[in-house]
Structures are given as structure tokens and as C-alpha cells.
């Protein structure tokens, strides 16, 4: 088996590939790419190699998260020789490989982009035969997906001493900001943003008091557009009803 | 559960044959290259072969090229290992081992079962 | 084939003690080198992997450093689970070729 010299070096941002002699291995891949929640993405990667002139055997990966160990989220392989490289692994079916990984390119095209997308992705290219190398971005590059706000659940429910609370949860990037208008609330009432863990584009408002029947609306808005959503209380000897 | 469990160790006299099976579950099989690696009692940890995810490239120590044979069977979840010509100097416990992160490459061995001992003695 | 030596082959030490075990290649091996922890009947256990980085479930008192041909394993503080036997293996190239481990034994 042939191996040589790796360089762990990885640069940053799309660079002109060198035609040294003794060409070392490196992977260019952007920062960063951003793209419109339903839009199509398309993430970069193009790499050099020592190995002159290798046609054998070879696998493009890319995936999701962290280098190494993240989940493949895409995967294919070519034959001895061959241009094509046959997909084996698209997670939804949604990934595509643009680039023809011959001529040094991996770069990947994603389809029907979600906000669940926006993460960090990393390349990496094998080759198998007589030369048995690979080698795989480290920093990858990071998938910022924008989205306009959706509200995503907007509800009343009990709270003690018999009163109502209105809650309001909506997705987008940037976070929206939510504002609350109702019944004695005035025109609007701004929410304090509250992200949840782990969910960074969801936000959370809360109306902790309602006071008066009648249409509560939740209005979400950031710098792609608006959504606004209502839900009305009606109270009937203790009970409520709500619907959107 | 993601895991790893061994099969079909025990004892064999020298020039005799012995197939060992591993059992995958809790993850995309085919996607990993998968290995073998042995441990003689009191001794260190030696690799042994790496089949790639599909089956088709298999890798082997000199020390057991041509009396030992690793496969896959992708449908069934299982890697094997069959062992002909056994000899005293192969006694040990056989890991079998999941690779990270790749069909062909083992760039670590993430994913270990508990072993099971193959004893070569007349 | 590419020959790993660890240094020391055994160590004594306290709980709360740093200790560092070192890896030499006998050929550069970029980073592709990985740290496990093996205890008495037990299969190995992957601590790091690509010579820095750490795997998921392992505590952050195990680091690992280096490039080239000389790596160190380092446990910041031991705890009493970590007395084992320790490995490092190339996987650059076939064959891969492992440590000849170092024992970490209780002072």
C-alpha cells in the first residue's frame, strides 16, 4: 500500500489549487453558506492530492455535526476509472453531489433546505487500491438556513385560581420576535424572546393573565416577513374553549 | 442497542479450522468498514483484517494472509471470520470492532465486542 | 509496517495525579492515530480518535495532542476508574499496528 506525507493543513476559503510537484493534501471548503428555508443549497469542497493520476477506487462522504465520527448524511462511489460516482447513501433523499470527485471536486447540493439543516458539514474523499489514502475536512463548512417566521403552536390553557395563560411558539431564523394583541392589552404587547435549549429557532411567549374574552393574537415577525396566529377565550361558567 | 457480540471461539488443534461470527445491531452495518483485532493472553492488541462496508476490498495481517478469510454478510447484520490452518501463535480473544465514521477507512475503532477466546492446542 | 512504542510500558500513580503517556511512530503518521483504555476482560474502549479529539461519552480529563510521530495521552486528574491498560494505534496505513500498552497502576 502507498502512503505519503499528509498535510493536516486545511484552508479556510476557496483557494486556488497549486500544480506543485509534490502536491499535498488539502481540502478548500467556505466558512460559511446560507440559503432560504425551502431553497436549495449548494456546500463547496474541492481538494488536492499526492497521489498523481489516481483513477482507482474511490468514496466522496459527506457529513453532519462533527468530523470523523458525524453521521453520513451523504455517500457514493466509483469504480476503477470511472466518472460516475454511483450514490449510495442520500438522508431523504435530499443530497447531491455536484462536483465530480475525478477532477477534485466534492462539492454537494441540497435540496428542499429545512431549518433542522442548519449545522456544520465536513467532506471527505477515499481512495482504495493500490494507493489506500483519505482524507477529510476538519472545519467543515456551516450551513446557515434562513427561514420566515411560522408560528407553530398557539394555545390557552388553565392556570391556578382559575385564570387562563395564552402560550405562543413560533420557528424562524433569525429568531422572530413575538408580540401578543388582545383585549385590554392595548395595540401590542412585546414578548421577551425565549429560546428553548436545544432549539434554537423556537421561540416562546407567554400572555401569563387573561383577563378579558375575546381574540388574543400572536404576531410573529423578523427581517424575512410576518406570521400572526389567534386564538380566542370564551368563558362559560368556569369553562373555556379556544380554537385557531 | 448499539453493540457488537462474538461467536463461535473455542478450542481447535493446531491445522485445524474455526469460523468466528459477529453480530451487529443498533447501527447501519453496511456503512462501516468492520475489523478484527486479537489479544494473546497476557499480551497486547494486534490487528488482524478490515473488510470495507460493501465487502468488496479485504485487508490482511501478514502474520494470517492466506489461512484466514473475512466476510461480510450485509442482509444479516454479521461479519465472519474463518480461520483454516490454525496454528499455537494464534491463540487469543478475537474482537471484532466497528469503524468510525467510514465504509473503507477505519480511522478508529469506536465500537468493540466483548471477544470471544479461540485456544489452538493439541 | 509502521512500529508505535509507548512510553512508559507502566505507571504508578494517585488518584488526583496528571499523567501523560507517550506514543512515538516509527514513520510520520499525520494524525491518524487513536487512545484506547482496555481494563482486565474487558474490550478496548475508544478515548480519542485523529490524535485530539475526543470521543462522545468520554470525560473531558483525557486529551490527547501531537502530530507527525510523537503523540501524548494526558488524564488531568486520574480518577479511580481510570487505572487500565492504555493503547495507541496508527491507522495511516495496513497494517495497522497498535502500542505495546501501558499499564496505570494505583501508587
Known amino acids: 500500500f502507498v502512503r505519503t506525507k499528509i498535510d493536516t493543513t486545511e484552508n479556510l476559503l476557496n483557494t486556488e489549487v497549486h500544480s506543485s510537484p509534490a502536491q499535498r493534501w488539502s481540502m478548500q471548503v467556505p466558512p460559511e453558506v446560507s440559503a432560504e428555508a425551502g431553497d436549495a443549497a449548494v456546500l463547496p469542497c474541492t481538494f488536492t492530492h499526492p497521489h498523481r493520476h489516481y483513477d482507482g477506487p474511490l468514496t466522496a462522504i459527506w457529513r453532519a455535526g462533527e468530523p470523523y465520527a458525524g453521521p453520513q448524511v451523504f455517500r457514493c462511489a466509483a469504480a476503477r476509472g470511472s466518472e460516475l460516482c454511483q450514490t449510495a447513501l442520500s438522508l431523504h433523499g435530499r443530497f447531491r453531489l455536484l462536483g465530480n470527485p475525478r477532477r477534485n471536486d466534492l462539492s454537494l447540493r441540497v435540496e428542499r433546505l429545512a431549518l433542522a439543516d442548519d449545522r456544520r458539514y465536513f467532506c471527505r474523499v477515499e481512495f482504495a487500491g493500490d494507493v489506500h489514502d483519505r482524507y477529510e475536512s476538519r472545519h467543515g463548512v456551516r450551513l446557515h438556513v434562513t427561514a420566515a417566521p411560522r408560528i407553530v403552536n398557539i394555545s390557552v390553557l388553565p392556570s391556578p385560581a382559575h385564570a387562563f395563560r395564552a402560550l405562543c411558539t413560533a420557528e424562524g431564523e433569525p429568531p422572530p420576535a413575538l408580540a401578543w394583541s388582545g383585549p385590554a392589552l392595548g395595540n401590542s404587547l412585546a414578548a421577551v424572546r425565549s429560546p428553548r435549549e436545544g432549539h434554537g429557532h423556537l421561540v416562546t411567549a407567554e400572555l401569563p393573565a387573561l383577563t378579558h374574552d375575546g381574540r388574543y393574537t400572536c404576531t410573529a415577525a423578523n427581517s424575512l416577513g410576518r406570521s400572526e396566529a389567534s386564538v380566542y377565550l370564551f368563558r362559560f361558567h368556569g369553562a373555556s374553549g379556544a380554537s385557531t | 442497542e448499539v453493540q457488537l457480540l462474538e461467536s463461535g471461539g473455542g478450542l481447535v488443534q493446531p491445522g485445524g479450522s474455526l469460523r468466528l461470527s459477529c453480530a451487529a445491531s443498533?447501527?447501519?452495518?453496511?456503512?462501516?468498514?468492520m475489523s478484527w483485532v486479537r489479544q494473546a493472553p497476557g499480551k497486547g492488541l494486534e490487528w488482524v483484517s478490515t473488510?470495507?462496508?460493501?465487502?468488496?476490498?479485504?485487508y490482511y495481517a501478514d502474520s494470517v494472509k492466506g489461512r484466514f478469510t473475512i466476510s461480510r454478510d450485509n442482509s444479516k447484520n454479521t461479519l465472519y471470520l474463518q480461520m483454516n490452518s490454525l496454528r499455537a501463535e494464534d491463540t487469543a480473544v478475537y474482537y471484532c470492532?466497528?469503524?468510525?465514521?467510514?465504509?473503507?477507512?477505519?480511522?478508529?475503532?469506536?465500537?468493540w465486542g466483548q471477544g470471544t477466546m479461540v485456544t489452538v492446542s493439541s | 509496517d509502521i512500529q508505535m512504542t509507548q512510553s512508559p510500558s507502566s505507571v504508578s500513580a494517585s488518584v488526583g495525579d496528571r499523567v501523560t503517556i507517550t506514543c512515538r511512530a516509527s514513520?510520520?503518521?499525520?494524525?491518524?492515530l487513536a487512545w484506547y483504555q482496555q481494563k482486565p476482560g474487558k474490550a478496548p474502549k475508544l478515548l480519542i480518535y485523529?490524535?485530539?479529539s475526543l470521543q462522545s461519552g468520554v470525560p473531558s480529563r483525557f486529551s490527547g495532542s501531537g502530530s507527525g510521530t510523537d503523540f501524548t495521552l494526558t488524564i488531568s486528574s486520574l480518577q479511580p476508574e481510570d487505572f487500565a491498560t492504555y493503547y495507541c494505534?496508527?491507522?495511516?496505513?495496513?497494517?495497522?499496528?497498535f502500542g505495546q500498552g501501558t499499564k496505570l497502576e494505583i501508587k
Open positions: 470492532a466497528k469503524a468510525i465514521g467510514s465504509s473503507w477507512y477505519s480511522d478508529a475503532f469506536d465500537l
Open positions: 494505534q496508527q491507522s495511516y496505513s495496513i497494517p495497522y499496528t
Open positions: 443498533g447501527f447501519t452495518f453496511s456503512s462501516y468498514a
Open positions: 485523529v490524535a485530539s
Open positions: 514513520q510520520d503518521i499525520s494524525d491518524w
Open positions: 473488510i470495507s462496508g460493501g465487502g468488496g476490498s479485504t
